[in-house]
Interface confidence: medium
């Protein structure tokens, strides 16, 4: 039987390196520093030499999305805004609308709103108290419905209390790749005050418990929302059977008219070769077992 | 497999606080998200509000300035607080599990697909 | 709040018709809906999720489609247990609306 794989946060979002230390400017991260961000490569001299000219009128010049290099126009406040979208202006940040029932999508989508971020972080504030106390948990909602705060999250509704992941405990996720023997190891390390080291093995314990994909879906909900940047990419959450097994067929986000491509895999999330599609075609697992 | 069961007063009088507790049993409270949905005799269903294990929630604005959603993981039960009843909140009250399953092209799909039987709360003096 | 709207609001049909029972959004909601089905005395039962996808051991008579606003539950062969009211429930936006419901009848 082939092993299960990782969790997606730790496998599917290692393109997603995280930094240790202040972020910069380069890596589009939050000025207060807390959340993790994405390395992007470095904009040396030629790739800003294939930047075409910024346009003439703008009331603000500012990166290109994700991790391009050459400057747009700035998104102004009350616009739509995506991960997709131009940046919005300094000041501003990108916040889905209060009642999207997802908020990570709606960024994917680009129906954020540029929102003034000092707005943003006081609802930050506000939204993020410390943990409930174990055991017998209870939270005033106070239009705690008002979604992501400043980045994809899943909104604060969906977050965990577990202090471990606390954006409020500014720790810094960085994730290392290594091989032992025949399953893939990730180790992630919590730096902060004190270091703490788990170890995931490509087979958890809870195996018994959920199939490999949907232990991977929650894990991925779980901990995209203390992202501050999603790679330009978007990000990949696997289409699981009830059991909690990968279904056949995988699909990677759509980037506007663009189709995702798609591949196949077995019930625990191998791809099997020859099945792919870059979007020109549909592809079609149905002729395989995955159960 | 899970199964949930709602418990807690048949008869509340006007003005007062209705308290239902749903306990869930053959499965873990944690790593789900828990609801509350209601029923008024004859009449449609009526989404009241969730929460997670952890404990955040989040409520129908329509009754949102009455409702409190609370889980004790240790009993493995969640709560329902509804203050100020009047007739109108006279109803069946379920308690179902509010899960997550992907798909495409969403990344995420959110279903109530295990139900307790439900209760009846009627308000009157 | 995105308003449900479900018609008919009843029908009567015999057993081996097929039903059709349509679903509209206030506003686009993508394929974020789903089927329930209640009996009388009885909690609510998942049929369809995300517009179109069966629920684990539904049968297969019960199909879903749509997107956008408009949607469809349909009943390929009706059989004597599928006489229940049926509701549609969005979860594109908070607050969770359902639809008013379609009650089903066997002639």
């Known amino acids: 039987m082939q092993r299960a794989r990782p969790t997606l946060w730790a496998a599917a979002l290692t393109l997603l390196v995280l930094l240790r230390g202040p972020p910069v400017a380069r890596a589009g991260a939050s000025s207060a520093g807390l959340g993790p961000v994405v390395r992007c490569e470095p904009c040396d001299a030629r790739a800003l030499a294939q930047c075409a000219p910024p346009p003439a009128v703008c009331a603000e010049l500012v990166r290109e999305p994700g991790c391009g290099c050459c400057l747009t126009c700035a998104l102004s406040e009350g616009q739509p805004c995506g991960i997709y979208t131009e940046r919005c202006g300094s000041g501003l940040r990108c916040q889905p609308s209060p009642d999207e029932a997802r908020p990570l999508q709606a960024l994917l989508d680009g129906r954020g709103l540029c929102v003034n971020a000092s707005a943003v972080s006081r609802l930050r504030a506000y939204l993020l108290p410390a943990p409930p106390a174990p055991g017998n948990a209870s939270e005033s909602e106070e239009d705690r419905s008002a979604g992501s705060v400043e980045s994809p999250s899943v909104s604060s509704t969906h977050r965990v209390s577990d202090p471990k992941f606390h954006p409020l405990h500014s720790k810094i996720i960085i994730i290392k790749k290594g091989h032992a023997k025949d399953s893939q190891r990730y180790k992630v390390d919590y730096e902060s005050q004190s270091t703490d080291t788990q170890n995931f093995s490509s087979e958890s314990k809870r195996e018994t418990e959920y199939g490999p994909c949907r232990r991977e879906m929650e894990d991925t909900l779980n901990h995209l929302k203390f992202l501050n940047v999603l790679s330009p990419r978007g990000v990949h959450i696997p289409n699981c059977d009830k059991k909690g097994f990968y279904k056949k067929k995988q699909c990677r986000p759509s980037k506007g008219r663009k189709r995702g491509f798609c591949w196949c895999v077995d019930k625990y999330g191998q791809p099997l070769p020859g099945y792919t599609t870059k979007g020109k075609e549909d592809v079609h697992c149905y002729s395989m077992q995955s159960k | 497999q899970v199964q949930l069961q709602e418990s807690g007063p048949g008869l509340v009088k006007p003005s007062e606080t209705l308290s239902l507790t749903c306990t869930v049993s053959?499965?873990?409270?944690?790593?789900?998200?828990w609801s509350w949905i209601r029923q008024p005799p004859g009449k449609g269903l009526e989404w009241i509000g969730y929460?997670?294990?952890?404990?955040?929630?989040n409520y129908n604005p329509s009754l949102k300035s009455r409702v409190t959603i609370s889980v004790d993981t240790s009993k493995n039960q969640f709560s329902l607080k509804l203050s100020s009843v009047t007739a109108a909140d006279t109803a069946v009250y379920y308690c179902?599990?509010?899960?997550?399953?992907?798909?495409?092209?969403?990344?995420?799909?959110?279903?109530?697909?295990?139900w307790g039987q439900g209760t009846t709360v009627t308000v009157s003096s | 709040a995105i308003q449900m709207t479900q018609s008919p609001s009843s029908l009567s049909a015999s057993v081996g018709d097929r039903v059709t029972i349509t679903c509209r959004a206030s506003?686009?909601?993508?394929?974020?809906l789903g089927w329930y089905q209640q009996k009388p005395g009885t909690a609510p039962k998942l049929l369809i999720y995300a517009a179109s996808s069966l629920q684990s051991g539904v049968p297969s008579r019960f199909s879903g489609s749509g997107s956008g606003t408009d949607f469809t539950l349909t009943i390929s062969s009706l059989q004597p247990e599928d006489s229940a009211t049926y509701y549609c429930l969005q979860d594109y936006n908070y607050p969770l609306t359902f639809g008013g419901g379609t009650k089903v009848e066997i002639k």
């Open positions: 929460i997670y294990y952890s404990g955040s929630t």
């Open positions: 506003r686009g909601i993508r394929n974020a």
């Open positions: 179902a599990r509010y899960d997550i399953v992907t798909g495409y092209p969403h990344y995420y799909y959110y279903v109530m697909d295990v």
């Open positions: 053959g499965g873990s409270i944690s790593t789900y998200y």
